[in-house]
């Protein structure tokens, strides 16, 4: 969490941002809040990116002002216009690209004063893994697949029964480049699995950590998966 304070002339206002991660090829949110003003026409929001000449986005007098917007962001940004009045300056970014990573500044002017805060935005790819029994294999085998990851993640298998066991000798992981030549499909196979056990396939890079669980019994198969973003901190 980064909390910034305004300086100079007028009073300073508190601006708060949260470091976050964007998933390549999806929409992302750059979070920023500020002390609200009672009059929308008095609020100016400017989003800037370190190393980029033009603006990322500007909102003033109750509407977008994009004449100074940098080429790399055109047609891809929007604030939540109906929420600006309550102090939400968050930016929606369409079709996140790898090159969108960097340091952003959320700069606010209201009738109460000015303030800004920086935000670290990471970009990569992350997706939920799905674990299935591989019936084509000669022995009892599990197959963990996740369609989109970047940078290349690590894959670790774990089991509820054999806690702490190292499955690297009985598993095989491959990474296949996707058609856009950035993200990769992750496939990991675990051999010699036993029945009545819960296995977990854990995929992790510096942006996200995802886990796919599968419980195989005589009568049924239960699956569960979850994904968590790493290093989301407020500023």
């Amino acid at each position: 969490l980064i909390i910034g304070f305004g300086i100079s002339g007028r009073h300073s206002i508190t601006v708060t941002t949260v470091a976050s991660a964007g998933n390549i090829g999806e929409d992302g949110i750059l979070s920023c809040t500020f002390e609200p003003d009672i009059k929308l026409s008095d609020i100016v929001i400017q989003w800037l990116k370190e190393g980029v000449l033009g603006l990322v986005h500007e909102f003033k007098e109750g509407k977008d002002e994009l004449s100074e917007q940098d080429e790399m962001f055109r047609g891809r940004t929007a604030v939540f216009a109906d929420q600006v009045i309550v102090g939400n300056a968050s930016l929606r970014l369409k079709n996140v690209q790898l090159t969108d990573a960097g340091t952003y500044k959320c700069y606010i002017i209201t009738s109460k004063g000015k303030g800004n805060a920086n935000l670290e935005y990471k970009t990569g790819a992350f997706s939920m893994p799905e674990v299935n029994v591989d019936y084509n294999a000669s022995s009892e085998t599990l197959r963990c697949e996740a369609p989109r990851w970047f940078p290349q993640p690590t894959v670790v298998w774990a089991s509820q029964v054999d806690q702490g066991a190292n499955f690297s000798e009985v598993s095989n992981t491959s990474f296949e480049l996707n058609s856009e030549n950035v993200t990769m499909k992750v496939v990991s196979v675990l051999y010699n699995v036993t029945i009545n056990n819960t296995y977990s396939c854990m995929i992790e890079n510096d942006i996200a950590k995802a886990t796919g669980d599968i419980k195989v019994t005589e009568s049924e198969i239960k699956r569960r998966s979850h994904l968590q973003l790493l290093n989301s901190k407020a500023s």
């Epitope: 998933n23 090829g25 999806e26 929409d27 509407k63 977008d64 002002e65 994009l66 004449s67 917007q69 790399m72 962001f73 055109r74 047609g75 891809r76 929007a78 929606r92 369409k94 079709n95 690209q97 997706s127 369609p147 989109r148 996707n178 058609s179 856009e180």
Partner: antibody, heavy 120, light 107 residues
């Protein structure tokens, strides 16, 4: 050659539901945002919704929000529009469109369209 | 939402004429303005992107200009096959809006 072929249109009663499909070919479907755009009987064009390349992000026009759901199956190169609580004003030709690759919010390819009529 | 207003609603022309079609946005949209052509019984096709950028495969007689809230599509020597409806589209925000169209017909 880029091809977008819509299907699933028809006559539905007010309050009813229908699902439109769009089969895409001739390009790497999973790399592109896709949108539905409709054209009313008066020939007005109205953007309906978009879905991101991976399918995880969607955005809707106010007129259909909460009633329509856009989705995609990249394994099948197919775009969908599930429509429910249909109203007579949803009557239109529905076009499947491909958005420009990385920026711009414009539509570089359009399908031939499929017609939805909402009437009792 | 941004409202796009096109004029005239109908334009009657003679082959060889130079014509201008107007599109006005209810607020400034910089150059985030795209043009489409729709011929009878066909789907729309992209003509011009970002107010003035040409599209591969589109004849050079089509050109666009303008910035802010006023835009123009020009056809410098109309051909009979240019008959149809021309739409402008705001590409500036996530909620995309189209003009009502200008119908180009032969006298």
């Amino acid at each position: 050659e880029v091809q977008l072929v819509e299907s699933g249109g028809g006559l539905v009663q007010p309050g009813g539901s229908l699902k439109l499909s769009c089969a895409a070919s001739g390009f790497t479907f999973s790399n592109y945002y896709m949108s539905w755009v409709r054209q009313t009987p008066e020939k007005r064009l109205e953007w309906v919704a978009y879905v991101s390349s991976g399918g995880g992000s969607t955005y809707y026009s106010d007129s259909v929000k909460g009633r329509f759901t856009i989705s995609r199956d990249n394994a099948k190169n197919t775009l969908y529009l599930q429509m429910s609580s249909l109203k007579p004003e949803d009557t239109a030709m529905y076009y499947c469109t491909r958005e420009s690759y990385s920026q711009g919010n414009y539509f570089d390819y359009w399908g031939q369209g499929t017609t939805l009529t909402v009437s009792s | 939402d941004i409202v796009m207003t096109q004029s005239p609603a109908t334009l009657s022309v003679t082959p060889g004429d130079r014509v201008s079609l107007s599109c006005r946005a209810s607020q400034s949209i910089s150059d985030y303005l795209h043009w489409y052509q729709q011929k009878s019984h066909e789907s729309p096709r992209l003509l011009i992107k970002f107010a003035s950028q040409s599209i591969s495969g589109i004849p050079s007689r089509f050109s666009g200009s303008g910035s802010g809230s006023d835009f123009t599509l020009s056809i410098n020597s109309v051909e009979p096959e240019d008959v149809g409806v021309y739409y402008c589209q705001n590409g500036h925000s996530f909620s995309l809006t189209f003009g009502a169209g200008t119908k180009l017909e032969l006298k």
